[in-house]
C-alpha cells in the first residue's frame, strides 16, 4: 500500500503567440481545480476507462479575474498535494492523466459551470520510494509544470511497496544485512524474498536471496532462455546448479486474475487481489461505483439495479460523455435560422436574430414593411429580413426622405449638359451626338442641333421638383 502524490507547480499560457490571456471566459471570474487519474500499465486506454489505480480531485483555487492589460502570469492554483492512495502493489508502469478544470463564477442561472480546460496524458515508469520526478507538459495553448512521486506507507517498503517491514524491539532482531526500516528506527526491512533482480515472470524462490528458474529459463536472474533439454525429465525442485525447475501445474499458472490483479495460491484454489476499481473472482468486474464520484460537471450518479451493474451519469444540459466530462458545443448544430447568432449561455441557448426575424430560433420572418412608410411616393419592398424603399425619381435614402440630384452621376455622355426635371432628367447633347444620354454619334451626313432647354430651366439652374 502507498500513496501517489502530485504537486502542481504552475499552470499558465504556454510560450509563443496566440497564448490565452486568461483561463476565464467572457462570462466573468473563474477558478481552477485539478483532477488526477491513474491507470495501470502503459497501454493507450480509452479516456472513458476507469481510473483503476485511483483518482483524486484538488480543492478549488483562488478566484481569478482577468486584468485585461496585464500579462498573463501563472494562474492562482489550489494549495496542497493531490494524493491518490493505492491499496495493492505499485505497478511501476502507469498512465498519468492530469485534467485542469475551470469553474466559472459569473452570473450563471443555477450556479457555476464547469468545463475541461486542458488534459495531459503521459505514460510513465516510476519506482516507489524514489525522488520527485519533475515534468513540463503542454496541452493546447496551456503549459503545466508538476512533480510526482509514489511512496510506500509502512509497513510496506520497496520499489513496488510489496515488501513488508516488521517491528523489532532490539537491534539484534534485525537479521544479518538487514537495515533499519527508514524512517522509523525501531523497524527493519523484511528480507527480500528473492535475489534482487530475479525475473518476476521466469523465476521464483523458496529461501531469501535465491533465484530459481522455471522451465526454459536459466541464468543467475532467470533472464536467459535455456534449451529445454537441460531440464528434461526433471519434476519438482532441482538440485542442478542451473536452478532449473519444471513446476507442476498450479492454480495461478497463466495468472487467471484480469485487470492487473495479483494471484495467490490457496489450498486447492487461488485468490485474486484486485486493483482499485475491479472486483470479482478474477477481477473481471469493473467496480467503479457511485461512491467513487465518477460524474463531473454536476452530473448525478445513478447506480445500477444491483451492485454488480455499472453506474451511469445523468449529465446536466450542456455536458455529455460517460462521466459528463465533455462540454457540448450546442451552437455547432447551427440551431439559429436565417443567419441568427448563436449564444450558449450554459443554462440555455439564445439566438440573436438579424433584423426582420424573431422567435427562439429566429424562425419567424417578420413583415418587413409593416408600419414602415416610404416617403415621397416610394414603395416598400420586403426581402432579406430588412425593409427597403424603392424611391420615386428625385428621391433617395432609406425612407426616400432625401432629395436626389439626378445629374450628380453625370449621366450625359460626350459633354452633354444635364437638366434636372420633375420626371427625371434631360440631356442637352453637344454637337455631333444624340440620344437620351447623348450616347450616339450623329452620322456625318446628318444635321446636328443643340436641343433647347426644357421650358422654365436654364443650364446650371438649381433643381426644382414639381
Amino acid at each position: 500500500a502507498g500513496v501517489f502524490e502530485l504537486q502542481i507547480h504552475s499552470f499558465g499560457p504556454g510560450p509563443g503567440p496566440g497564448a490565452p490571456r486568461s483561463p476565464c471566459s467572457a462570462r466573468g471570474p473563474c477558478r481552477l481545480f485539478f483532477r488526477v487519474c491513474l491507470k495501470p500499465g502503459l497501454s493507450e486506454e480509452a479516456a472513458e476507462s476507469p481510473c483503476a489505480l485511483g483518482a483524486a480531485l484538488s480543492a478549488r483555487g483562488p478566484v481569478y479575474t482577468e486584468q485585461p492589460e496585464a500579462p498573463a502570469p501563472d494562474l492562482p492554483l489550489p494549495n496542497g498535494l493531490l494524493q491518490v492512495p493505492f491499496r495493492d502493489a505499485w505497478p511501476g508502469t502507469f498512465s498519468l492523466i492530469i485534467e485542469t478544470w475551470r469553474e466559472e463564477l459569473g452570473d450563471q442561472i443555477g450556479g457555476p459551470a464547469w468545463s475541461l480546460l486542458a488534459r495531459v496524458t503521459r505514460r510513465r515508469r516510476l519506482a516507489a520510494g524514489g525522488p520527485w520526478a519533475r515534468d513540463i507538459q503542454r496541452a493546447g495553448a496551456w503549459e503545466l509544470r508538476f512533480s510526482y512521486r509514489a511512496r510506500c506507507e509502512l509497513p510496506a517498503v520497496g520499489t513496488a511497496c510489496t515488501r513488508l517491514c516488521r517491528p523489532r524491539s532490539a537491534p539484534s532482531r534485525c537479521g544479518p544485512g538487514l537495515r533499519p526500516c527508514a524512517p522509523l528506527e525501531d523497524e527493519c526491512e523484511a528480507p527480500p524474498v528473492c535475489r534482487a533482480g530475479c525475473s518476476l515472470e521466469h523465476g521464483f524462490c523458496e529461501q531469501p536471496g535465491e533465484c530459481r528458474c522455471l522451465e526454459g529459463w536459466t541464468g543467475p536472474l532467470c533472464m536467459v532462455p535455456a534449451s529445454t533439454s537441460s531440464c528434461l525429465g526433471l519434476r519438482g525442485p532441482s538440485s542442478a546448479t542451473t536452478g532449473c525447475l519444471v513446476p507442476g501445474p498450479g492454480p495461478c499458472d497463466g495468472n487467471p486474475c484480469a485487470n492487473g490483479g495479483s494471484c495467490s495460491e490457496t489450498p486447492g484454489s487461488f485468490e485474486c487481489t484486485c486493483p482499485r476499481g475491479f472486483y470479482g473472482l478474477r477481477c473481471e468486474v469493473s467496480g467503479v461505483t457511485c461512491a467513487d464520484g465518477p460524474c463531473f460537471n454536476g452530473g448525478l450518479c445513478v447506480g445500477g439495479a444491483d451492485p454488480d451493474s455499472a453506474y451511469i451519469c445523468h449529465c446536466p444540459p450542456g455536458f455529455q460523455g460517460s462521466n459528463c466530462e465533455k462540454r457540448v458545443d450546442r451552437c455547432s448544430l447551427q440551431p439559429c435560422r436565417n443567419g441568427g447568432l448563436c449564444l450558449d449561455l450554459g443554462h440555455a441557448l439564445r439566438c440573436r436574430c438579424r433584423a426582420g426575424f424573431a422567435g427562439p430560433r429566429c424562425e419567424h420572418n417578420l413583415d418587413d414593411c409593416a408600419g414602415r412608410a416610404c416617403a415621397n411616393g416610394g414603395t416598400c419592398v420586403e426581402g432579406g429580413g430588412a425593409h427597403r424603399c424603392s424611391c420615386a425619381l428625385g428621391f433617395g435614402g432609406r425612407d426616400c426622405r432625401e432629395r436626389a440630384d439626378p445629374c450628380a452621376a453625370r449621366p450625359c455622355a460626350h459633354g452633354g449638359r444635364c437638366y434636372a426635371h420633375f420626371s427625371g432628367l434631360v440631356c442637352a447633347c453637344a454637337p455631333g451626338y444624340m440620344g437620351s444620354r447623348c450616347e450616339f454619334p450623329v452620322h456625318p451626313d446628318g444635321v446636328s442641333a443643340l436641343p433647347a432647354a426644357p421650358p422654365g430651366l436654364r443650364p446650371g439652374d438649381p433643381q426644382r421638383y414639381l
Epitope: 450556479g111 454536476g298 445513478v302 444540459p317
Partner: antibody, heavy 118, light 108 residues
Framework: QVQLQEWGPGLVKPSETLSLTCTVS????????WSWIRQPPGKGLEWIGY???????NYNPSLKSRVTISVDTSKNQLSLKLSSVTAADTAVYYC????????????WGQGTLVTVSS | EIVLTQSPGTLSLSPGERATLSCRAS???????LAWYQQKPGQAPRLLIY???SRATGIPDRFSGSGSGTDFTLTISRLEPEDFAVYYC?????????FGGGTKVDIK
C-alpha cells in the same frame, strides 16, 4: 422570471391514481431537467423523480413501481402520475427545476396539497 | 442511498445571534455536491447554498456553507427576523436524491 404552477385534484380516493400537472413559464422545458418532490404535512421533503425532455427519467426506488413522470414540450408542462395511492401519499406536491450546475433545485412551484381519503 | 442526518432538530436563538446547523452524511458526498434550502410555513423551499459553499443568486452573505466528505455546516452569522424557518440539506452526488430531516430555527 421562471415560474412553476402545480394543479390537479386536491382529493384522491385510496387505490386510485393521483395526477398532477405543472405549467412552466419563463424557461423552456427542453432546456432543463424537471422534478417532483413531496412533503407530508409536518414532515420533511421526499424526492419523487425527475425527467429530461429527451425522455430520460429517474425515480426514487421507494416509489418507482407506482410513478410516471412525463413532459409535454408543446405546452411547456410536466405531469406526475402516482398509482395505487394510500393515506401515506397525502402531501404537498411540488414541481421544481433542476439547476444546470447539478441536481439540486433552483426554482420551485408553490405546491399543491393532495389528500388521499375515501 | 445516502442518509442525511441534520442536527439539532430545533435551534432556539435570538435575532442577532449566530446559528450553526449540521448535516452529516452516511457516506462521503463526492465533490461536495450538497445543497441547503430554507422553508418558511406555507411556502416552498428556497435554494440558499449549493456545492456545499456557493451562495445562490440573491442570498445574503450572512448565509455561508462549509464542510466536505460527510460533515457539512450551514452558518447564519447574524440571525435576522426573516431567517427563522426550517432548513434542509440535500445531496446530489448520487441517486436517489435525498434530503435531511430538517432543522427548525425558532425564536428563543
Amino acid at each position: 422570471q421562471v415560474q412553476l404552477q402545480e394543479w390537479g385534484p386536491g382529493l384522491v380516493k385510496p387505490s386510485e391514481t393521483l395526477s398532477l400537472t405543472c405549467t412552466v413559464s419563463g424557461a423552456s422545458i427542453s432546456s432543463f431537467y424537471w422534478s417532483w418532490i413531496r412533503q407530508p404535512p409536518g414532515k420533511g421533503l421526499e424526492w419523487i423523480g425527475y425527467i429530461y425532455y429527451s425522455g430520460t427519467t429517474n425515480y426514487n426506488p421507494s416509489l418507482k413501481s407506482r410513478v410516471t413522470i412525463s413532459v409535454d414540450t408543446s405546452k411547456n408542462q410536466l405531469s406526475l402520475k402516482l398509482s395505487s395511492v394510500t393515506a401515506a401519499d397525502t402531501a404537498v406536491y411540488y414541481c421544481a427545476r433542476i439547476a444546470v450546475a447539478g441536481f439540486f433545485f433552483d426554482y420551485w412551484g408553490q405546491g399543491t396539497l393532495v389528500t388521499v381519503s375515501s | 442511498e445516502i442518509v442525511l442526518t441534520q442536527s439539532p432538530g430545533t435551534l432556539s436563538l435570538s435575532p442577532g445571534e449566530r446559528a450553526t446547523l449540521s448535516c452529516r452524511a452516511s457516506q462521503s458526498v463526492n465533490k461536495n455536491y450538497l445543497a441547503w434550502y430554507q422553508q418558511k410555513p406555507g411556502q416552498a423551499p428556497r435554494l440558499l447554498i449549493y456545492g456545499a459553499s456557493s451562495r445562490a443568486t440573491g442570498i445574503p452573505d450572512r448565509f455561508s456553507g462549509s464542510g466536505s466528505g460527510t460533515d457539512f455546516t450551514l452558518t447564519i452569522s447574524r440571525l435576522e427576523p426573516e431567517d427563522f424557518a426550517v432548513y434542509y440539506c440535500q445531496q446530489y452526488d448520487r441517486s436517489p436524491l435525498t434530503f435531511g430531516g430538517g432543522t427548525k430555527v425558532d425564536i428563543k
